[in-house]
């Protein structure tokens, strides 16, 4: 059940966590309870859910998402105040790609927090998460440019070129997902 994140440290950039234990991998421990907990994922810079076994483990384990964010995300409390007052990206814009459990083939869009752009992905047709939009415009309006103007310019041209992959089928996924919604 333990979450894995085995990318290299070079991908972390300048995002330094507030405490050294925030950099530890999620550890479900040896026991067999099923306790919903949260950990800070150094590689996505987000607090994520995992299932804790109930004993041992490490300090990178929190009972609530809020507690995890406050403890491990630099400037989180300031950002939370700012988010309440202005047009900010909704939290779900930062969720990882989740095709869901079903085996359909629906062309959808999601906001990629790494590239800071909306991109096409293949959705299985059920479940998943809210970082999932029917149209590119809807994704851009909500996640790329919330509360902003009409966008346009070079970014749109690059975006149009970038989503051509779908004609030849979906791209390969290079990262490993562990979803615990």
């Amino acid at each position: 059940l333990s979450e894995e994140a085995d990318d290299t440290d070079s991908e972390l950039g300048s995002m330094k966590p507030l405490h050294t234990f925030c950099a530890m991998k999620a550890d479900d421990g040896p026991c067999k309870a099923m306790i919903r907990s949260y950990f800070f994922n150094m590689y996505t810079h987000q607090c994520e859910e995992f299932i804790y076994g109930g004993c041992e483990g490490n300090e990178n384990r929190f009972d609530t998402l809020e507690e995890c964010k406050k403890t491990c995300i630099p400037g989180y409390e300031k950002t939370a105040v700012k988010a309440a007052s202005g047009a900010e990206r909704p939290d779900f814009c930062f969720l990882e790609e989740d095709p869901g459990l079903c085996r359909g083939y629906m062309k959808r869009y999601l906001y990629n927090n790494q590239t800071k752009q909306c991109e096409r992905f293949v959705y299985g047709g059920c479940l998943g998460n809210r970082n999932n939009f029917e149209t590119l415009d809807e994704c851009k309006k909500i996640c790329e440019n919330p509360g902003g103007g009409s966008g346009g310019g070079l970014n749109d041209i690059f975006e149009a070129q970038k989503i051509e992959w779908h004609e030849g089928g979906p791209p390969h996924h290079h990262h490993h997902h562990h979803h615990h919604h």
Epitope: L101, C102, R103, G104, M106, G125, C126, N129, H178, H181
Partner: antibody
């Protein structure tokens, strides 16, 4: 043939816990996503939770999020639903179902259900 | 209050044709999610009747058919028989609920006479 048999239901007090099981046979259990759906007495169907074939992805209805945990043991061909902090409104027949086997996204095969009653 | 809306009841005489509607919105049926239909005979578990809007699982008679258009779907039953008396549920998924499964409230079909 494909069969799903639920067990573990019963009478429990509000705030209590219960663990439901669903024993599967007649198909390659680990290849399929599974789900729990419930039906309150005299009412309609309500989707509760789902889990991928490997058990790595889990999903919950807002009404049970944080209280219920879905899991599976593929070596035992068994699906589980751990229900904590139970409320009167959780009273229902709980069905397990195979999700998206031949249909891509429907609940293809259902068990016979197990009754959970939450009452003091 | 169910996310998908069905009439509480419909009825018909043996041999007749009846339809059951399932009305959704732009975040579920209208968002491209498939619609599925289930039949629940009295005292039994639901059974998949129609999947993917209009497909019948093996063993389901061709008297049952499904269709979808825009934000709604419908189930048609022709040549009504006494054993069709049951509750019928439509089901889809809803993007505003993170793609969660959603059901209609169910329709009780009564075969008259």
């Amino acid at each position: 043939q494909v069969q799903l048999v639920e067990s573990g239901g019963g009478l429990v007090q509000p705030g209590g816990s219960l663990r439901l099981s669903c024993a599967a046979s007649g198909f390659t259990f680990s290849s399929y996503a599974m789900s729990w759906v419930r039906q309150a007495p005299g009412k309609g169907l309500e989707w509760v939770s789902a889990i991928s074939g490997s058990g790595g992805s889990t999903y919950y209805a807002d009404s049970v999020k944080g209280r219920f945990t879905i899991s599976r043991d593929n070596s035992k061909n068994t699906l589980y639903l751990q229900m904590n902090s139970l409320r009167a409104e959780d009273t229902a027949v709980y069905y397990c179902a195979i999700l998206g086997a031949t249909s891509l996204s429907a609940f293809d095969i259902w068990g016979q259900g197990t009754m959970v009653t939450v009452s003091s | 209050q169910s996310v998908l809306t069905q009439p509480p009841s419909v009825s018909g005489a043996p041999g007749q044709r009846v339809t059951i509607s399932c009305t959704g919105s732009s975040s579920n049926i209208g968002a491209g999610y498939d619609v599925h239909w289930y039949q629940q005979l009295p005292g039994t578990a639901p059974k998949l009747l129609i999947y993917g809007n209009s497909n019948r699982p093996s063993g389901v008679p061709d008297r049952f058919s499904g269709s979808k258009s825009g934000t709604s779907a419908s189930l048609a039953i022709t040549g009504l028989q006494a054993e069709d008396e049951a509750d019928y549920y439509c089901q889809s998924y809803d993007s505003s609920l993170s793609g969660s499964g959603v059901f209609g409230g169910g329709t009780k079909l009564t075969v008259l006479g």
